[in-house]
């Protein structure tokens, strides 16, 4: 912590300007009035402060705003944003997309994924929902950041906004996030024709249930293996060999290359070997011919 000293009269600060770069840490602490700093935050980013000096300025703002900074200050943080922790950001209330853009630009190239995720979360809370303007801002200034939001926050996305989401924006989404986004995408694209629908729904299919995957297999979509591998394991396991063959079309030979990877490996283990042999790919590991499969869960339910 910066030790408290009295400000020498000749060092008194009446405005935030370049002369402050020559102040030692303790002089900044003693001589810069926090309210003045907050009022002239727009000047701070143009001044080449050292990281140590920025620590002092942050400390001043923290003392002035223990409950969190107002948006008028947040908007002009500039490189001071790099000093913020997720805990600091959690106290903020941000509604302006200009503020979000400014801070996303500053964070670029820095290891700030936790801070950025918290900032985006605060923007969604502040604006009440994940509206089209917010999604457009995220896709433009922070590809992949959409996936930093929790499933709970993503549930506030109206289906009408889904069209603004690009495949690369979903690249880092996990299964729980896609579970939330997929039904919205299905709704958003429901009036499209088969091939156009598949192109649009493809990035969201990691959240699709078995019945929807089965339905796709009847539509000659020729799903590529990259998409197939992103499907939920639970959605893939009930598919028959014939359904998978129809679903993948000419890409079916890719099963051989991926046979060691889940969900292909798990699916192979559930198929009859003679069914797998019909594919002519040399897939091994299916249930041997002549074996019976007993579903013990059904038997337990009956007893």
């Amino acid at each position: 912590d910066v030790e408290r000293t009295t400000c020498p009269p000749e060092k008194e600060v009446h405005e935030i300007d370049e002369s402050l770069i020559f102040y030692k840490k303790r002089e900044l602490e003693a001589c810069v009035d926090a309210a003045l700093l907050a009022a002239q935050m727009d000047r701070v980013d143009a001044i080449p402060f050292t990281y140590e000096q920025l620590d002092v300025l942050k400390h001043k703002l923290d003392e002035l705003y223990p409950q969190g900074y107002p948006e008028s200050v947040i908007r002009h943080l500039g490189h001071l944003f790099l000093k913020m922790s997720p805990e600091d950001i959690r106290k903020w209330n941000v509604t302006s997309l200009e503020t979000l853009k400014a801070l996303l630009k500053v964070s670029k190239g820095h290891e700030m994924s936790a801070q950025v995720a918290t900032l985006i979360d605060r923007v969604v809370v502040g604006r009440g929902q994940l509206d089209k303007d917010t999604v457009d801002t995220l896709t433009a200034f922070c590809p992949g950041c959409l996936c930093s939001l929790s499933p709970e926050r993503l549930s506030s996305v109206p289906p009408s906004v889904i069209g603004a989401v690009r495949p690369q924006d979903l690249d880092t989404c996990g299964p729980r996030q896609l579970d939330v986004l997929y039904p919205k995408a299905r709704l958003a694209f429901q009036n499209m024709s088969g091939s156009e629908y598949f192109v649009k729904i493809r990035p969201f299919l990691g959240g699709a249930p078995t019945e929807d995957v089965k339905a796709l297999s009847q539509q000659n979509v020729s799903m590529d293996l990259a998409t197939f591998m992103k499907l939920r394991r639970e959605a893939v396991l009930p598919l028959t060999v014939a359904e998978v063959q129809k679903l993948l079309g000419p890409h079916v030979e890719g099963l051989k290359v991926e046979e060691q990877h889940s969900p292909v490996r798990d699916w192979i283990l559930k198929q009859r070997q003679d069914d797998l042999d019909t594919l002519g790919l040399g897939l091994q590991g299916g249930i041997p011919n002549g074996y019976l499969i007993l579903d013990l869960s059904v038997r337990e339910a009956l007893s």
Partner: antibody
Framework: EVQLVQSGAEVKKPGASVKVSCKAS????????MDWVRQAPGQGLEWMGD????????IYNQKFNGRVTMTEDKSASTVYMELSSLRSEDTAVYYC????????????WGQGTTVTVSS | EIVLTQSPDFQSVTPKEKVTITCSAS???????LSWYQQKPDQSPKLLIY???NLASGVPSRFSGSGSGTDFTLTINSLEAEDAATYYC?????????FGGGTKVEIK
């Protein structure tokens, strides 16, 4: 432009571990597996294993089992290959190479990372 | 594992001459699952041919591939100076994926 950029050369003592990174750019990271291939001085190519960046699932060449670990960081579009219990025979150039999921050929390669194991 | 044996190990060839490199597999390889790479000194390997006979993007048409089962061939129809390199065949028909030992082509 599609690029795979690997971390710099390493010199390690026998018994130590090395972790090589491979940063991808210019394509959808999760549509391609990342494989690792090594080449000892004056020798041929040897496949070590691969990772599916979408699921984090890995397959290793059994020759390296227990010694090699491949991981990914989707947010940074980066994969890592760590080789432990190094011996002098592990001196080689290590390449990452992308492979479109469902195919087995490597259409883009990293520049290679030289790992030297010497006491 | 499938062992891929390339021959010859080394070939010294005059420009404009035809070069044939063979890759023999210890057991059958599905032809969709064989590729060829070119590696020049101090460079990373480069994809030349995939699925036995398909030319990779940007590869000159003087390169071609053929074969099935256990015997595969890479042909350079009219060798050019820039083709001096080591060539590797590679299979992913069976786990673990393997490479041939390489054929070094030198310009006379």
């Amino acid at each position: 432009e599609v690029q795979l950029v690997q971390s710099g050369a390493e010199v390690k003592k026998p018994g130590a571990s090395v972790k090589v990174s491979c940063k991808a750019s210019g394509y959808t990271f999760t549509d391609y597996n990342m494989d690792w291939v090594r080449q000892a001085p004056g020798q041929g190519l040897e496949w070590m294993g691969d990772i599916n960046p979408s699921t984090g699932g890995t397959i290793y060449n059994q020759k390296f089992n227990g010694r090699v670990t491949m991981t990914e960081d989707k947010s940074a579009s980066t994969v890592y290959m760590e080789l432990s219990s190094l011996r002098s025979e592990d001196t080689a150039v290590y390449y990452c190479a992308r492979r479109r999921i469902g195919t087995g050929y490597f259409d883009v390669w990293g520049q290679g990372t030289t790992v030297t194991v010497s006491s | 594992e499938i062992v891929l044996t390339q021959s010859p190990d080394f070939q010294s060839v005059t420009p404009k001459e035809k070069v044939t490199i063979t890759c023999s597999a210890s057991s059958s390889v599905i032809s969709s699952y064989l590729s060829w790479y070119q590696q020049k000194p101090d460079q990373s390997p480069k994809l030349l041919i995939y699925r036995t006979s398909n030319l990779a993007s940007g590869v000159p048409s003087r390169f071609s591939g053929s074969g099935s089962g256990t015997d595969f061939t890479l042909t350079i129809n009219s060798l050019e100076a820039e083709d001096a390199a080591t060539y590797y065949c590679h299979q992913w028909s069976s786990f673990p994926y393997t490479f041939g030992g390489g054929t070094k082509v030198e310009i006379k």
